[in-house]
């Protein structure tokens, strides 16, 4: 059968029918349904929601919907022994204690099982000592403290403001600096937008609001006790001392009312510059310790959380492909939330639900996609991307042979200004073409395309007339698919006009105030931005699953490879004498990129000309496209990060949320001037250039004519 016979309806009509079936009102209803009670990973409530989604996806018409369960390490506060932080006087008396819970939002006062704010996977402990304020606790903040200001954090409790980088990196940096405890807080400078009221009167963070979150440094491992393998019934589990990525010092998050009480007494060094000052009425002194009158007072942490092996449940739905059932396009997003999950994740889960419903409607009318579509509702994302990673570990052999693409579907909104897309370069043209066909939901862009409003509001820094598309980092469920398995991946959501605050999240992120009402009253009353995100995510899945030739353009990879090579060379050029002394050359990398560019160009020409009615040749060309992303995987992984195997992209070693290009070379060059053995350090730079050059050349050769 030809593709069109197999799928029953002409391709254009299919896509239109699919998009027209998506309804804002349904997304709104689903969001309401998913956010009335907490759905914390490992709880009965989240298991019940998994079964509800399984049942509804079956009703919507998927061929099969199964639960996939795993027993993974999770972390919970002790219900009878709460976590808090004190200021103690010289006699050890607690003269101030931080709050034990967030004041519940209106209408939610009687909801049970709201987990109090905590840092998941913090060890137990009751350290006491002087406080040091470490700004965002980034690598550069500790450099400033230790190298410029000569402040020693060893044996101190550090207090860091949330934002800029993933909280797990903050904790790792504090540990390396010798701290014995970490206090994380939300500063109004980062989580209170000027001119907006706090919840429930606006979308800003109130003083009693607190950001929950895990503080792991898993580097893609999944369940800390079963790295590399699924946490199934017969799993061998590591002892807790050998677990991957667990923090070694107690950590606890607080809101800015409590932070004010700690920071207002700080003495010691003044902040080094204005970038260390937030918006509280405190001096932002670095410390160590409190000022004169309060110098005998100390800070004490009381942390009693426990790590427990707990069952989690993914929901996996299948819509079998009519022509290539052994080729998988995956749409996945998580279901577990810290509390109500009004934005994270249920604004995404509601969109996935509506996409499934639309696909199911088409299927009931006799249509099938060309390729198989898998839908996933992941569990325990908030505890370290555990559900998605365990499932991918269990199914890695199928995925590496059959995985065409993965589209992520966490929060649909983090603002309502414009579109934000992070994806593999293979998907650039798909995203451009799709957004040109979709209507913009933005005020002032009536009758204009989404592409137009997106390009106007978020222009590419390199190419005029094109929108910005960012690199994939991590901190979400695409990680295992892209960074470990090399499956082409992408994500899309609506975002804020807040480029300077890129990684701080929206003000109410991971707080009790992330409710249905937050979305319905303040972010998207008409659910038009949710609908647009559904059209983008759903449209990408549709095209990936249904187009006869995969909608990947390998020439776009060539363009970015050249840009990334130039970037990493520019970083190395800051050390010209060392490059000369140790004969460091990037010529092999630039040569490989040039070869890739030429081969990709020829491949694209053949792609235009080949006989698409020949199923063998069609499959061959599509396989070359599908396996191109896979060709960037190094089976040995990156140094000390075996589950980050993509040579072109990895999460930054300094911020899990951000993507870094040529990460092996980048990390080898980072702070190289401080290395004790320069010869060894530059030898590693040369080795990483070799690995990168080889990988780019090898990937290029997968696009050459096969014989």
């Amino acid at each position: 059968k030809s593709s069109n016979e197999a799928t029953n309806i002409t391709p254009k009509h299919n896509m239109k029918a699919f998009l027209d079936e998506l309804k804002a009102e349904n997304i709104k209803k689903f969001l309401y349904n998913f956010t009335q009670i907490p759905h914390l990973a490992g709880t009965e409530q989240n298991f019940q929601l998994a079964k509800q989604i399984q049942s509804q996806w079956k009703e919507f018409g998927l061929d099969s919907v199964e639960l996939a369960h795993y027993d993974v390490l999770l972390s919970y506060p002790n219900k009878t022994h709460p976590n808090y932080i004190s200021i103690i006087n010289e006699d050890g008396n607690e003269i101030f204690n931080t709050s034990l819970f967030e004041p519940p939002p209106p209408g939610y006062e009687n909801v049970s099982d709201i987990v109090p704010p905590f840092s998941a996977f913090s060890p137990q402990g009751m350290p006491e000592g002087d406080l040091v304020y470490v700004n965002y606790a980034r690598t550069e903040d500790f450099f400033k403290l230790e190298r410029d200001m000569k402040i020693n954090c060893s044996g101190k409790i550090v207090i860091a403001r949330y934002g800029k980088v993933f909280r797990g990196n903050k904790v790792k940096n504090a540990q390396l600096a010798g701290a014995k405890g970490v206090i994380l807080y939300s500063d109004p400078a980062d989580y209170f937008a000027p001119g907006v009221k706090s919840y429930p009167d606006g979308w800003n963070l109130p003083g009693g609001g607190v950001q929950r979150g895990n503080i792991l440094n898993l580097n893609g491992a999944g369940d800390p006790l079963t790295p590399g393998y699924p946490a199934n019934e017969y799993a061998y589990r590591r002892g807790i001392a050998e677990a991957v990525g667990l923090p070694s010092i107690p950590v606890h998050p607080i809101g800015y009312y409590d932070a004010q009480k700690l920071l207002e007494k700080m003495g010691g060094s003044a902040p080094p510059d204005s970038s260390w000052r937030g918006s509280l009425k405190v001096p932002y002194n670095v410390g160590p310790g409190f000022t004169g009158n309060f110098s005998t007072q100390k800070v004490k942490m009381h942390i009693h959380s426990t790590n427990e092996v707990t069952r989690i449940y993914n929901v996996i739905g299948t819509l079998r492909g009519a022509v290539e059932p052994d080729r998988y396009v995956i749409l996945g997003g998580h279901r577990d939330s810290w509390v109500f999950g009004g934005i994270d994740p249920q604004s995404g889960a509601a969109v996935v639900h509506e996409i499934v419903r639309s696909f199911g409607t088409l299927k009931k009318e006799g249509w099938r996609p060309r390729r198989t579509i898998l839908f996933a509702s992941w569990d325990a994302e908030e505890f370290g991307l555990l559900g998605s990673t365990e499932w991918a570990e269990e199914n890695s052999r199928l995925l590496q042979e059959r995985g065409v693409a993965y589209i992520n579907a966490d929060s649909s909104i983090e603002g309502n200004y414009t579109l934000r897309v992070d994806c593999t370069p293979l998907m650039y043209s798909l995203v451009h073409n799709l957004t040109k066909e979709l209507k913009s939901p933005d005020e002032g862009f009536e009758g204009k395309s989404l592409y137009e409003s997106w390009t106007k509001k978020s222009p590419s820094p390199e190419f005029s007339g094109m929108p910005r598309i960012s690199k994939l980092g991590s901190g979400n469920d695409f990680e295992v698919f892209f960074q470990r398995l090399g499956i082409a991946s992408g994500r899309a959501r609506y975002t804020k006009n807040w480029e300077t605050n890129k990684f701080s999240g929206y003000p109410l992120y991971h707080s009790v105030y992330e409710t249905y009402e937050l979305v319905e009253k303040f972010y998207d009353p008409m659910f038009k931005y949710h609908l647009t995100v559904a059209q983008v995510r759903g449209g990408m899945v549709f095209e990936l699953a249904n187009s006869i030739v995969l909608p990947f353009d390998c020439r776009d990879y060539a363009v970015v490879l050249r840009k990334y090579a130039d970037k990493i060379y520019s970083i190395s050029m800051k050390h010209p004498q060392e490059m000369k002394t140790y004969s460091v050359s990037f010529d092999s990398l630039f040569s490989a990129v040039k070869n890739f560019t030429e081969i990709a160009s020829k491949f694209s020409e053949r792609l235009q000309d080949f006989d698409k009615s020949n199923p063998i040749v069609l499959r061959m060309m599509n396989d070359q496209l599908m396996f191109l992303e896979r060709a960037f995987i190094d089976p040995l992984g990156l140094p000390d990060r075996p589950f980050y195997r993509h040579v072109i992209y990895a999460p930054s070693s300094h911020n899990k949320y951000a993507g870094e290009s040529f990460p092996g070379i980048y990390d080898a060059l980072f702070d190289i001037e401080s290395k004790v053995d320069p010869s060894k350090a530059w030898g590693e730079v040369k080795r990483q250039i070799y690995v990168a050059a080889f990988t780019v050349q090898a990937a290029a050769e997968t696009l050459s004519e096969v014989a």
Partner: nanobody, 118 residues
Amino acid sequence: EVQMVESGGGVVQPGRSLRLSCAASGFTFSSYAMHWVRQAPGKGLEWVATIYQDGSESEYVDSVKGRFTVSIDNAKNTLYLQMDSLRAEDTATYYCVGRDSTSITPVWGLGTLVTVSS
């Protein structure tokens, strides 16, 4: 032939200014970044400044920050280094370094000598 030629060097008193130019021929300034590197007499090579893409972003070694300004004129295919408040320690041969958008090896200029002396 692909080459870059620096000019504008000379002898100048401390506190005065100079403007170095680097004219490229045989290739266009479409690469990601262009660099200035210097070598003081009897010393090793030292990176001075980098300018990225369309000239919107630049970086400098700490010792020249606030005194030197790198710029680019794509139409003239020329890179510049404006050097103000010159000091004796700025005495060096200054090289421009770049890469054509299709080239494999970097292209270095022959250098121009700047001597800061009273």
